[in-house]
Interface confidence: low
């Protein structure tokens, strides 16, 4: 009997390991898809940009390294902000490093001052985990400083030099990001 229980437990553990592996594969696949989509989008932009207009970023976008950023002049709720970025062939800003955060906050200070700007960060309703739009988790130093008390869905935004959280249905400016075009020589 004990042997039987032990065998079942081992089988269950094996099944669990397989499921975890599958989940890990899925997460990796999802991330890779998001990256591929960005590269594909950059490739399409490259192909479509004419020889006359080979600047790395469109008009009114700011460049930093291989990214272009658009700081909106109009506000909307988080979901609509994401839609608006998608229409421009971009996504809501995903902050990958402290260097990128410093560039963004420095640029905002010059452009507009201390307003709120949606970024592509939202909180999973079930687990409470913060996730970027490509499914990845922000690095520990880039987690929103305050947990919103809202019972509604919570999303991330940048204000001054902080990453904060708020009800996704509130109105804010937003920042879109896309890959900069490589200049064709």
């Amino acid at each position: 009997k004990l042997l039987q229980v032990s065998t079942i437990a081992m089988q269950q553990q094996e099944k669990l390991i397989q499921q975890e592996r599958a989940l890990l594969n899925f997460t990796e696949w999802k991330r890779s898809c998001a990256l591929q989509m960005k590269y594909c989008q950059a490739f399409m932009q490259n192909s479509l940009s004419s020889a006359h207009n080979s600047s790395p970023c469109p008009n009114n976008w700011i460049q930093n390294r291989e990214s272009c950023y658009y700081v909106s002049e109009i506000w909307s709720i988080w979901h609509t902000s994401q839609e608006n970025c998608l229409k421009e062939g971009s996504t809501l800003l995903q902050i990958e490093s402290k260097e990128e955060m410093d560039f963004i906050t420095g640029s905002l200070r010059k452009i507009k001052g201390s307003y709120d700007y949606w970024v592509g960060l939202s909180q999973d309703g079930h687990s409470g985990r913060w996730l970027w739009q490509d499914g990845s988790s922000p690095s520990p130093g880039l987690l929103p400083a305050e947990r919103s008390q809202s019972a509604n869905q919570v999303c991330g935004y940048v204000k001054s030099n902080s990453l904060l959280s708020s009800n996704c249905s509130t109105w804010k400016y937003f920042i879109c990001e896309k890959y900069a075009l490589r200049s064709s020589v």
Epitope: I74, W75, S76, T80, K87
Partner: nanobody, 120 residues
Framework: QVQLQESGGGLVQAGGSLRVSCAAS????????VGWWRQAPGKQREFVAA????????SYSNSAKGRFALSRDNAKNTVYLQMDSLKPEDTAVYYC?????????????WGQGTQVTVSS
């Protein structure tokens, strides 16, 4: 349902000023941006300026920035657009609207429109 009633349009010389008003009634406006869009003859309707009713934040289009000023009277539920340094290209029908997003053009309620003509 939100009802919007514009007034104050008219004919003005280039360089002149005009103030148009929009009185809103009906449903609560707290979920909306209320403001102005315009449509010039043969052109698409375009965003001019709007106020986020709950936060009071105001947005202007590039063409309106610096020349037009949006304000509101909470007690009267009325939005005003003060237009200065008017140019012939500002000639259009100006529509008051309540929108759930000004950028994506998701306008939920439109007014009837008021004609603004700027002569050179």
């Amino acid at each position: 349902q939100v009802q919007l009633q514009e007034s104050g349009g008219g004919l003005v010389q280039a360089g002149g000023s005009l103030r148009v008003s929009c009185a809103a009634s009906g449903r609560t406006l707290s979920n909306y941006a209320v403001g102005w869009w315009r449509q010039a003859p043969g052109k698409q309707r375009e965003f001019v300026a709007a106020i986020n009713w709950s936060s009071g934040g105001i947005s202007y289009s590039n063409s309106a920035k610096g020349r037009f000023a949006l304000s509101r009277d909470n007690a009267k539920n009325t939005v005003y657009l003060q237009m200065d340094s008017l140019k012939p290209e500002d000639t259009a029908v100006y529509y008051c609207a309540a929108a759930s997003s000004v950028l994506s053009g998701t306008v939920d309620y439109w007014g009837q429109g008021t004609q603004v003509t700027v002569s050179s």
